[in-house]
């Protein structure tokens, strides 16, 4: 009785119960009566990450510069390599297939959190008590300057985007 | 049914080289492989290589660096190229099926001599 | 490389003898899926070799059930119940579980 379900590790084909090819190699011809499955081994910049019936084996990523990229991780016949961003870039998708530079955050945000080779400049509104000033990939909402610890007076109430100024108290006449 | 005719040159001068050519029938190149297996006089058998549907290869270590095989898919042929032949070269040479291993062609006789 | 050795060389029988030959591996031929790929065949005078048995025991077919193939992991057996005189010749096991293939040195069956 010819099966019509394999173990684990195996595929059905011509009515037989062949053995998948390990990751790093490629299916070169199914088993037979005669014969157990034959595999060879993936070529240079090659991959296979999975038990497989592949007749070819996938090319290595390319981390093309032009595009800002670098290899985080080198390839090997059972892994893929893995690309990164230059500094001060990240990838534009979890594939990372091409860079852009990172987000700054305009006056009035600050960095709720920096940018990684794979992640984009998170930016927050400044709170009410917090500023910023500048537009930076870098820099976070800071407090308002408190006038009462420098025995000052607010002279002009900070923004999102200004700190307060102080000013010296009125002195009784 | 399946078929596998070898032709070759019958003679081959020692240190020259060999060209044999394996003309099959009945299953297709593109799907399946074929091994080149050869019989010196009243001698065992010995596999030399094999050219897999692909067109990858794998060879036999003793014999790879003067060894090499192809094949023509639209004329179903597969070829055995050989150098440098010396007198222990001299056998049958067989081509086969794989997974066909039930037929084997009447082979072709080689002999090196001068 | 896998290396097949055969005995006896030669063996000679009567015709309605039993005849067996023996074929050992330098190593163990059970592929990792379970199976050994371990094949006999019989060259008459004149002829390219004619398969008998395949994986182990598998009788191809077509051939008669006098022929038996038996044995495991680097031990096997071909036996022929009671020898006719048209299986005469030179017998050879093969195995293709590991590459290269690499076949035994040949045993030659004969009349006493």
């Known amino acids: 009785e010819p099966p019509t379900a394999c173990r684990e590790k195996q595929y059905l084909i011509n009515s037989q119960c062949c053995s998948l090819c390990q990751p790093g190699q490629k299916l070169v011809s199914d088993c037979t009566e005669f014969t157990e499955t034959e595999c060879l081994p993936c070529g240079e910049s090659e991959f296979l990450d999975t038990w497989n019936r592949e007749t070819h084996c996938h090319q290595h990523k390319y981390c093309d510069p032009n595009l800002g990229l670098r290899v985080q991780q080198k390839g090997t016949s059972e892994t893929d390599t893995i690309c990164t961003c230059e500094e001060g870039w990240h990838c534009t998708s979890e594939a990372c297939e091409s860079c852009v530079l990172h987000r700054s955050c305009s006056p009035g945000f600050g960095v709720k959190q920096i940018a990684t080779g794979v992640s984009d400049t998170i930016c927050e509104p400044c709170p009410v008590g917090f500023f910023s000033n500048v537009s930076s990939a870098f820099e976070k909402c800071h407090p308002w300057t408190s006038c009462e610890t420098k025995d000052l007076v607010v002279q002009q109430a900070g923004t999102n985007k200004t700190d307060v100024v102080c000013g010296p108290q009125d002195r009784l006449r | 049914q399946v078929q596998l005719k070898e032709s070759g040159p019958g003679l081959v001068a020692p240190s020259q080289s060999l060209s044999i050519t394996c003309t099959v029938s009945g299953f297709s190149l593109p799907t399946s492989g074929v091994h080149w297996v050869r019989q010196p006089p009243g001698k065992g058998l010995e596999w030399l290589g094999v050219i897999w549907a692909g067109g990858d290869t794998n060879y036999n270590s003793a014999l790879m660096s003067r060894l090499s095989i192809s094949k023509d898919n639209s004329k179903s042929q597969v070829f055995l190229k050989m150098n440098s032949l010396q007198k222990d070269d001299t056998a049958i040479y067989y081509c086969?099926?794989?997974?066909?291993?039930?037929?084997w062609g009447a082979g072709t006789t080689v002999t090196v001599s001068s | 490389d896998v290396v097949m050795t055969q005995t006896p060389l030669s063996l000679p029988v009567s015709l309605g003898d039993q005849a067996s030959i023996s074929c050992r591996s330098s190593q163990s031929l059970v592929h990792s899926s379970g199976n050994t790929y371990l094949q006999w065949y019989l060259q008459k005078p004149g002829q390219s070799p004619g398969l008998l048995i395949y994986k182990v025991s598998n009788r191809f077919s077509g051939v008669p059930d006098r022929f038996s193939g038996s044995g495991s992991g680097t031990d096997f057996t071909l036996k022929i119940s009671r020898v006719e005189a048209e299986d005469l010749g030179v017998y050879f096991c093969s195995q293709t579980t590991h590459v290269p293939w690499t076949f035994g040195g040949g045993t030659k069956l004969e009349i006493k």
């Open positions: 086969l099926g794989h997974g066909h291993f039930d037929v």
